[in-house]
Interface confidence: medium
């Protein structure tokens, strides 16, 4: 029994996939695909605004954490990387690039530095940082 | 211009994918797909033999490191996890489950414990460990 048919238009062959297996994506070439979301880790250090612009130029946004279950690959991420979370001083809330508010219990926010942007660190931690500080960053593209 | 057509047999719809985007896999459901390899990180601690058996039961093997370029997602992996590397005392070499010898300069082998198995740690390090010690583990399935 086969669950899907992938039509490879280049060779015009059908590749059959077992029910337990599936394709992931589509994602930009050489990005990580997990539970139909696309992720890429960028080594070069940029400030938050430059990181955001870099993701946008690739039709993506900075990392948005929306589910510990769907994004459990983030548990094991080493080091610190810009994500798309910013502090809104007027109401004191933390919100994502798309305007949605950070859900409670998703991230442990750690306020060591003074700042309005946040770095993602393993085990769903968010470290507040000055937005002008250069850091590596994670871009994300949702496919669903 | 579109690079591929994915035929969704459930809804019988064609989804067009830009040239710069592609599907990854196929992989077991909810595994990580990267450069057409499938990876899964398992939280439960098992000894090396149990970890190997767990991967095999999922039609996969313990992690094999074969390319820093194709597997650069492994740079950022936190913690220590069994991989498919074992020491062959008769000739002193390190080899993978498939019998191939560890290529030079792929891993930095660090002899912390006396043992014949190896844990993967970030930035392409391999920590020697007693094969009977319980650890988390990484399974891998190559799709190409």
């Amino acid at each position: 029994i086969w669950s899907a048919v992938f039509l490879n238009s280049l060779f015009n062959q059908e590749v059959q996939i077992p029910l337990t297996e599936s394709y992931c994506g589509p994602c930009p070439k050489n990005w990580i695909c997990y539970k139909n979301n696309c992720y890429q880790f960028f080594d070069e250090s940029k400030n938050w605004y430059e990181s955001q612009a870099s993701c946008m130029s690739q039709n993506a946004s900075l990392l948005k954490v929306y589910s510990k279950e769907d994004q459990d690959l983030l548990k094991l991420v080493k080091s610190y990387h810009w994500m798309g979370l910013v502090h809104i001083p007027t109401n004191g809330s933390w919100q994502w690039e798309d305007g949605s508010i950070l859900s409670p219990n998703l991230l442990t926010i750690i306020e060591m530095q003074k700042g309005d942007c946040a770095l993602y660190a393993s085990s769903f931690k968010g470290y507040i940082e000055n937005c002008s500080t250069p850091n590596t960053y994670i871009c994300m593209q949702r496919t669903v | 211009i579109w690079s591929a057509v994915f035929l969704n047999s459930l809804f019988n719809q064609e989804v067009q994918i830009p040239l710069t985007e592609s599907y990854c896999g196929p992989c077991p459901k909810n595994w990580i797909c990267y450069k057409n390899n499938c990876y899964q990180f398992f939280d439960e601690s098992k000894n090396w033999y149990e970890s190997q058996a767990s991967c095999m039961s999922q039609n996969a093997s313990l992690l094999k490191v074969y390319s820093k370029e194709d597997q650069d997602l492994l740079k950022l992996v936190k913690s220590y996890h069994w991989m498919g590397l074992v020491h062959i005392p008769t000739n002193g070499s390190w080899q993978w489950e498939d019998g191939s010898i560890l290529s030079p300069n792929l891993l930095t082998i660090i002899e912390m414990q006396k043992g014949d198995c190896a844990l993967y740690a970030s930035s392409f390090k391999g920590y020697i460990e007693n094969c009977s010690t319980p650890n988390t583990y990484i399974c891998m399935q190559r799709t190409v």
Partner: nanobody, 120 residues
Amino acid sequence: QVQLVQSGGGLVQPGGSLRLSCAASGFTFDDYAMSWVRQAPGKGLEWVSAISWSGRTTYYAESMKGRFTTSRDNAKNTLYLQMNSLKPEDTALYYCARGDVAIRGNLDAWGQGTQVTVSS
């Protein structure tokens, strides 16, 4: 330029107390987390504690928890390390530093160091 000037070290008996100070200048003190690091004779650097910019969050190395307290006075641009129940193994050169090595590993400015000797 960034300057961190330390004071308050000295000789103390086991079980005694000392308070170290670190006066900061040349930067906006309350923008930064701060840390204490020490180096025992013939040993490498050992992280002691870190404190957030506001002083609301502190972290300590396991062996110092309950004995050492890090605080700061942002109005005075000064960082403090209160050391109680001192042991001979606390003998070291103590440094204050800008940043939070426990969290980010980035200490970009250091004090001159102050010697603490615990001996009877």
